[in-house]
């Protein structure tokens, strides 16, 4: 569907041209669709003298005034002016209403049935205004930060929202710092989260017609300084043919800024280790974690001399970690031969 066709699917109130001055009462959270002229030649909408942009939560677009979810600040005077002139096609005042009721659920929302010039809407059970945003269930947040839960909904009468934690009514009275609620934004905010804030948070949205609920699973990550953590199994033992390219991967996790080196173990005077007990190594690559592709070691056009042990060494202000892997290089003429390589080593 094109956007224009999609909008056509929405009920759109089209105030009559005979009644230029109108007053509409709209419930908080209610979506608004108002027409002005035909879609292809629709007028321009203005709020309090300022023209509405074609994008955003409140927008004037193809002759339509669209408000995704009516908020108190949306109340006011709206004008629709004909394109290319200053002729007023619509002169509307939107008023915030607590709730809207209708005596007839089956009435066409496009028809004008209220002699007082106020529009009412059919009753409707609560629904999520953006259901596509309510799919990710589990959220991990570092301790000390702030979490905002939101469950924007609409319905008629305007639904109410309440919150549960682990199935129990949640008012935050036992939480240091408490909680902050914004019913008009369908939100709950918890500042400076701590591990005891972990749990399942449920928003329960209900009105006289029905109810809906959504669960957020919150995990709070405690951070304690530690030496870098290297992903198990990386770098991996690799077998390659002479002349081919090889990539060795090392995945590093670190709270403090890490420094990474790629080392190749070498033999000097027939020995792999020095008098101090440390292995002889050649530094192939060194950088901090912000450098592009530092966690990958590229070996181009490998030869037999490239075979051997490679180590990814990561350090930060707390300590060092390293893991090693073996590269086996096969001659071109015998690509099916494989050798048993020692297992990758991990030292923390």
């Amino acid at each position: 569907l094109e956007a224009s066709e999609e909008v056509e699917l929405e009920p759109c109130l089209a105030p009559s041209l005979e009644q230029q001055e109108q007053e509409l009462t709209v419930a908080l959270g209610q979506p608004v669709r108002l027409c002005c002229g035909r879609a292809e030649r629709g007028g321009h909408w203005y709020k309090e003298g300022s023209r509405l942009a074609p994008a955003g939560r409140v927008r004037g677009w193809r002759g339509r005034l669209e408000i995704a979810s009516f908020l108190p600040e949306d109340a006011g005077r709206y004008l629709c002016l004909a394109r290319g002139s200053m002729i007023v096609l619509q002169n509307l005042t939107l008023i915030t209403g607590d709730s809207l009721t209708s005596s007839n659920d089956d009435e066409d929302p496009k028809s004008h049935r209220d002699p007082s010039n106020r529009h009412s809407y059919p009753q409707q059970a609560p629904y999520w205004t953006h259901p596509q945003r309510m799919e990710k269930k589990l959220h991990a947040v570092p301790a000390g930060n702030t979490v905002k839960f939101r469950c924007p909904a609409a319905g008629n009468p305007t639904p109410t929202i309440r919150w549960l934690k682990d199935g129990q009514a949640f008012h935050g009275e036992n939480r240091i710092g408490g909680i902050r609620l914004r019913h008009q934004h369908w939100s709950l905010v918890m500042e400076s989260v701590v591990p005891s804030d972990r749990g399942t948070y449920t928003c329960l949205v209900e009105n006289a017609v029905g109810s809906i609920r959504y669960n957020y699973l919150l995990d709070v990550l405690e951070r304690s300084p530690h030496r870098p953590i290297l992903q198990a199994g990386l770098p991996a033992n690799t077998t390659a043919v002479v002349g081919s390219d090889v990539e060795l991967l090392c995945k590093v996790y670190s709270d403090a800024q890490p420094h990474i080196q790629w080392l190749k173990h070498i033999v000097i005077n027939g020995s792999s280790f020095g008098a101090d007990g440390f292995p002889y190594v050649q530094v192939l690559k060194t950088a901090d974690i912000n450098s592009s592709e530092v966690e990958v070691l590229y070996l181009r056009n490998v030869s037999a001399e490239d075979a051997g042990e490679y180590t990814c060494l990561a350090g930060n202000s707390i300590g060092l970690s390293y893991q090693s892997a073996w590269l086996t290089v096969l001659p071109e003429e015998d690509p099916t031969w494989t050798a048993a390589a020692p297992e990758a080593r991990y030292t923390d």
Partner: antibody
Framework: EVQLVESGGGLVQPGGSLRLSCAAS????????ISWVRQAPGKGLEWVGR????????NYADSVKGRFTISADTSKNTAYLQMNSLRAEDTAVYYC????????????????????WGQGTLVTVSS | DIQMTQSPSSLSASVGDRVTITCRAS??????LAWYKQKPGKAPKLLIY???FLYSGVPSRFSGSGSGTDFTLTISSLQPEDFATYYC?????????FGQGTKVEIK
């Protein structure tokens, strides 16, 4: 009490380098972040960049990308702003600010808020 | 970049006045907007986050509202210590951007 103290400002020639420090105390250093914001004389605030002290990730304004580097030493509770290839337009008071995330789980993004600021340090780039 | 435009750029008011400052974003920033107060020669101070949440320790005469592109900071009854420059700042887009500031002066 949360405190941030900047140091390292001064006069430097165009093309030169300077490293600013931001010593922090009174909060768990690795759980939040540090932002750098600057203010040219008589002008408004301009965000320079931010580091998340937990994972070391950094973000920069386009105007300083490739020239400025933000880093941190968690053992010293200190963040740094390394400024290279300085230009006259980099002249400003530089503030560091503790930055925490508001994790909006509905839209799955993080709003970054700067709640504690240092006193600022003046950097003058002039020949 | 998302442009933040504050209005007015300056205003004169008296103690006890109700003051309203507006901030408009060049594109939708949802509720990802903060307000800061700065006195001459001092660092900024956080007043409001997420468009309408009062930061702890900030007097209740300050309030924020709005979402999408249009936001408002209101001081219900101006006090002597409120004469300062106020900045809005969005952080939903990269980079974070500030408004140009609104200077509140004594009438």
């Amino acid at each position: 009490e949360v405190q941030l103290v900047e140091s390292g400002g001064g006069l430097v020639q165009p093309g030169g380098s300077l490293r600013l420090s931001c010593a922090a105390s009174g909060f768990t250093f690795t759980s939040t972040g540090i932002s750098w914001v600057r203010q040219a004389p008589g002008k408004g605030l301009e965000w320079v960049g931010r580091t998340h002290l937990g994972d070391g990730s950094t973000n920069y304004a386009d105007s300083v990308k490739g020239r400025f580097t933000i880093s941190a030493d968690t053992s010293k509770n200190t963040a740094y702003l390394q400024m290279n290839s300085l230009r006259a337009e980099d002249t400003a008071v530089y503030y560091c600010a503790r930055t925490y995330g508001i994790y909006d789980l509905y839209v799955d993004y993080t709003e970054y808020v700067m709640d504690y600021w240092g006193q600022g340090t003046l950097v003058t780039v002039s020949s | 970049d998302i442009q933040m435009t504050q209005s007015p750029s300056s205003l004169s008011a008296s103690v006890g006045d109700r003051v309203t400052i507006t901030c408009r974003a060049s594109q939708d920033v949802d509720t990802s907007l903060a307000w800061y107060k700065q006195k001459p020669g001092k660092a900024p101070k956080l007043l409001i986050y997420s468009a309408s949440f009062l930061y702890s320790g900030v007097p209740s005469r300050f309030s924020g509202s709005g979402s999408g592109t249009d936001f408002t900071l209101t001081i219900s009854s101006l006090q002597p210590e409120d004469f300062a420059t106020y900045y809005c700042q969005q952080s939903t887009g990269h980079p974070q951007t500030f408004g140009q500031g609104t200077k509140v002066e004594i009438k």
